[in-house]
Amino acid sequence: THLGIRLPLRSGLAGPPLGLRLPRETDEESEEPGRRGSFVEMVDNLRGKSGQGYYVEMTVGSPPQTLNILVDTGSSNFAVGAAPHPFLHRYYQRQLSSTYRDLRKGVYVPYTQGKWEGELGTDLVSIPHGPNVTVRANIAAITESDKFFINGSNWEGILGLAYAEIARPDDSLEPFFDSLVKQTHIPNIFSLQLCGAGFPLNQTEALASVGGSMIIGGIDHSLYTGRLWYTPIRREWYYEVIIVRVEINGQDLKMDCKEYNYDKSIVDSGTTNLRLPKKVFEAAVKSIKAASSTEKFPDGFWLGEQLVCWQAGTTPWNIFPVISLYLMGEVTNQSFRITILPQQYLRPVEDVATSQDDCYKFAVSQSSTGTVMGAVIMEGFYVVFDRARKRIGFAVSACHVHDEFRTAAVEGPFVTADMEDCGYNIPQTDESTLMTGRA
């Protein structure tokens, strides 16, 4: 069944305020790979909330078994619950599938938070609200897990959309998207529009909410405003990019740009927060604190541990600064910036004790594995994973949450020299370690 109609978001307009809608730029249109224009059958095929991940409905096996699968651009295994678990309503039953093939191999995947293990096989897979194809894909049947499945999240598996280099147990295990492209005529590109709720969801609203869209094989122009700006994929493992400058309310953090990418910067839909390297996080928090100093918040808030609440509808968005990340552009010495609002980096959460209040968690946190541009960043933008051309595109999302004064933005070009120097070169070890955050 279709996932339901798109609802206007309570604390923001569906697009920029009237009069501010940017004209569609066409200079990049002719260069887009794949089908252009409308992917009606794929729009609104995601559900979920930033705190628990976004999932797409998939079917596995013959006859088809329907499962909800977390969309994760920060890992590369397609894995599904395959045994009873207290948090799972349903799971993949291999013995019921006539097309299941055992690969006779175990697999173990640790994330920053949570881990799982299981048995590898292949089966027929399709996406009901996706392209009209069925592919044979590698599947990890999860038999044991720890802090991986989330109570009430409504997903039963994970779709790792990154590259084979970080697949487990090794890079010989072909990821789902590679199989999809190889076995069909679908172009090697997908795009994500993650629509943050903008307000805490109670049970009734949660059922009606729509999470966003995963467009497989191209770009849907109805999902963004303005133009798409592209940053190169530095290396095909995670979706690694290079940040060349960071500003808080237009104030440069003035750090050596290598610090922003230490030890990497990735775009990861499976992580909730914007995660920053220790030094960068400390500088950013100092700057955000200073900008929002008209109100005092406990230290626990800045550590992501404590909620802050305001009477419903009175959240003082204007006291919080915007955060801008400048990304390496496609042209030498050219960058562009993406700007998010507090509506993205303050994550709405339900506080049972004060359900009449609007409560939020600070969704910027510290990382020891580099910058992770998680859902709080992605919820501001339509993000194009143009694998065919080794680049990631950003445009202002048509569903991002904002107010009448400010909107998320993607702007450029800016002149930035020596951007290559901003990338950190990880010392070569025998094996790279998958440490995707699930913060």
């Epitope: 191999k105 299981g118 038999t143 147990p169």
Partner: antibody, heavy 124, light 107 residues
């Protein structure tokens, strides 16, 4: 000190059944994978079965699949191997072994130490 | 099934000599390979795991190397207590398999 004590071995006729037990102490049993390995007299080693800490992941050798069942009782710190439809080629010393973590398939999670073993003889 | 072939079957050496034991897999096992030592009447004990990591309490004279299909266990200078049978084992694919063993005996 880690201790693994196997019991339940003995002489059984072909087609018969036997249940081996492995009593574990000196570590948190529920947080370790456990396994059974066998060694026929004068021969090499053969993996028989293994289970993750909570029993979710289970491995069986092809030669015993459908005949042997591994299980564990974490409240009793005991690992079991139920052996049915026994054959002459199942004759061996059966060792119980402790995994390096709760995970069965994790790199680094190898099995050590092993118990001293219990002899199973299948003969008419 | 992945077959692990150990060579030589028997290695006759004197204490103080260097022992080099080989384990070859019929297909890649990445680094999911370990080495065990077994003395007569005793249970095996883990020496090396994940191809090159020494297990807890194992002396530095034991070292492992290799990945993919070719693996080596080296004992840099044999001690009297090192004379035993050595097995390699893989956990990359089902079924998990052991090599046939290499017996290191006193010359």
């Amino acid at each position: 000190e880690v201790q693994l004590l196997e019991s339940g071995g003995g002489l059984v006729q072909p087609g018969g059944s036997l249940r081996l037990s492995c009593a574990a102490s000196g570590f948190t049993f529920s947080s370790r994978a456990m396994g059974w390995v066998r060694q026929a007299p004068g021969k090499g080693l053969e993996w028989v079965s293994a289970t993750s800490g909570s029993g979710g992941s289970i491995y069986y050798a092809d030669s015993v699949k459908g005949r042997f069942t591994i299980s564990r009782d974490n409240s009793k710190n005991t690992l079991y191997l139920q052996m049915n439809s026994l054959r002459a080629e199942d004759t061996a010393v059966y060792y119980c072994a402790k995994g390096g973590s709760q995970w069965l398939y994790a790199p680094g999670s190898w099995f050590d130490p092993w118990g001293q073993g219990t002899l199973v003889t299948v003969s008419s | 099934e992945i077959v692990l072939t150990q060579s030589p079957a028997t290695l006759s050496l004197s204490p103080g000599e260097r022992a080099t034991l080989s384990c070859r897999a019929s297909q890649s096992v990445s680094s999911y390979l370990a080495w065990y030592q077994q003395k007569p009447g005793q249970a095996p004990r883990l020496l090396i795991y994940d191809a090159s990591n020494r297990a807890t309490g194992i002396p530095a004279r034991f070292s492992g190397s290799g990945s993919g299909t070719d693996f080596t266990l080296t004992i840099s200078s044999l001690e009297p207590e090192d004379f035993a049978v050595y097995y390699c084992v893989q956990r990359s694919n089902f079924p998990w398999t052991f090599g046939g063993g290499t017996k290191v005996e006193i010359k």
